[in-house]
């Protein structure tokens, strides 16, 4: 049994750890394999996630974590039963992939205006809470080319656009995803969409 | 430096109840681990008694003989877990020690206890009339 | 699920080489850990995931085996090793942690 590419995890600086790795060939990975984790620490237990099948040759699995800290470190042995198949360490705060935002609303019940709204993932006290910026994508589900991303570079979790600047009639799905500057994070995963009905009409005089 | 205290335990009649503390001091309660409680009758051998996951899903597991009469849980913000203890018998006499475990994880919601590496240096229940 | 240990009790000298096993009734993989306990002291861990060395036990305390058969062996006795073990079992089937019986080790003679 052998590892074709090495696990590569990502933080979500909060509770859990994602690792991902290939296999020579097709691989049982809760039934043959076990990844144990340790914070580097002297009193500290280590340990044992069971992965789950990625893929025909691949595995995840998931590892669940104190309240991360910047200078946390862990190490990492991938085990096939008795058999050491790759040791590592990962150092959560410098891969860290934000969560998803959540709960994203579209209002249209303001005049002329499209408000989005959405859930930081994250509670007031990490430190990912005030570094999230966000980018919206918005598209038209009847023509995938009528498509755009709005950056949100201010703190609060909203975007109004004009109703204008959407095709009337039509329509529109939105999602959105965030990422931490400051802590040189790779994209989340987008947010589920939300589908709204787009029905302003321009003023008479402008037809 | 890591550290677990029990209190709690004394005398108490047959039939009687009793609730057992445990104070984690040097971690937090609430992070990654287990927190459980074993016992030890005198001159007997060490019986686990149950556990409940320290984060904020806080599952639980109970040794079969335990369900029922014996009640786990926990108050993040004390940084302590308790053991609720009713209809005491004579042979719930025994020192009762609390300890952090390790788990095993599959994906983020099935987790249950393994060893337990961090002890107290437990109360003794003596039930008697 | 059910722990096995034997013997209950065993008497060897200093330098002794000295094993005790345990048995589980179920395969429980590599989930077993064994303990050390003196009197009026809570128990102390030795090995974890069978034969995994605990943080600043002797290197003289080593153990073996996976599935249902466990040893636990101490290369050379020393005067501080006279105690009480356990081994512990943990099955992931119903999330349940079993001691075994204990084997007490006192000096021969």
């Known amino acids: 049994m052998k590892v074709l590419q090495e696990p590569t995890c990502v933080s979500d600086y909060m509770s859990i750890s994602t690792c991902e790795w290939k296999m020579g060939g097709p691989t049982n990975c809760s039934a043959e394999l076990r990844l144990l984790y340790q914070l580097v620490f002297q009193s500290s237990e280590t340990h044992t996630c069971v992965p789950e099948n990625n893929g025909g040759v691949g595995c995840v699995c998931h590892l669940l974590m104190d309240d991360v800290v910047s200078m946390d470190n862990y190490t990492l042995d991938l085990w096939a039963g008795q058999q050491l198949l790759w040791k590592g360490s990962f150092k959560p705060s410098e891969h860290v992939k934000p969560r998803a935002p959540g709960n994203l609303t579209v209002h249209t019940n303001v005049s002329d205006t499209v408000l989005l709204t959405w859930s930081n993932p994250y509670p007031p006290d990490n430190y990912l809470y005030n570094d999230l910026t966000y980018a919206v994508n918005i598209w038209n589900e009847n023509d995938l080319a009528d498509s755009r991303i709005h950056n949100v570079t201010y703190l609060k979790p909203t975007l109004r656009i004009p109703a204008s600047t959407l095709k009337s009639g039509i329509s529109y799905r939105a999602r959105v995803r965030a990422w931490a500057q400051h802590y040189n994070t790779t994209w989340s995963e987008w947010s589920p969409s939300t589908k709204w009905y787009n029905s302003y009409r321009e003023p008479f005089e402008q037809r | 430096e890591s550290q677990l205290v029990e209190s709690g335990g004394g005398l108490v009649q047959p039939g009687g109840s009793l609730r057992l503390s445990c104070a984690a001091s040097g971690f937090s309660s609430s992070s990654a681990h287990y927190m459980c409680w074993v016992r030890q009758a005198p001159g007997k051998g060490l019986e686990w008694i149950a556990c409940?996951?320290?984060?904020?899903?806080?599952?639980?597991y109970y040794a079969s003989w335990a369900k029922g009469r014996f009640t786990i849980s926990k108050d993040n913000s004390k940084n302590t877990v308790y053991l609720q203890m009713n209809s005491l018998r004579a042979e719930d006499t025994a020192v009762y020690f609390c300890a952090r475990a390790a788990f095993v994880n599959r994906g983020v919601s099935w987790i249950w206890p393994y060893y337990f590496s961090l002890w107290g240096q437990g109360t003794l229940v003596t039930v008697s009339s | 699920i059910q722990m096995t240990q034997s013997p209950s009790s065993l008497s060897a000298s200093v330098g002794d080489r000295v094993t005790i096993t345990c048995q589980a009734s179920e395969d429980i993989e590599s989930y077993l850990a064994w303990y050390q306990q003196k009197p009026g002291k809570p128990p102390k861990l030795l090995i974890y995931?069978?034969?995994t060395l605990a943080y600043g036990v002797p290197s003289r305390f080593s153990g073996s085996g996976s599935g249902t058969d466990f040893t636990l062996t101490i290369s050379s006795l020393q005067p501080e090793d006279f105690a009480t073990y356990y081994c512990l079992g943990s099955s992931y089937s119903t999330g349940s942690n079993i001691f075994g019986t204990g084997t007490k080790v006192t000096v021969l003679g």
């Open positions: 409940i996951y320290a984060g904020s899903r806080g599952s639980t």
């Open positions: 995931r069978a034969s």
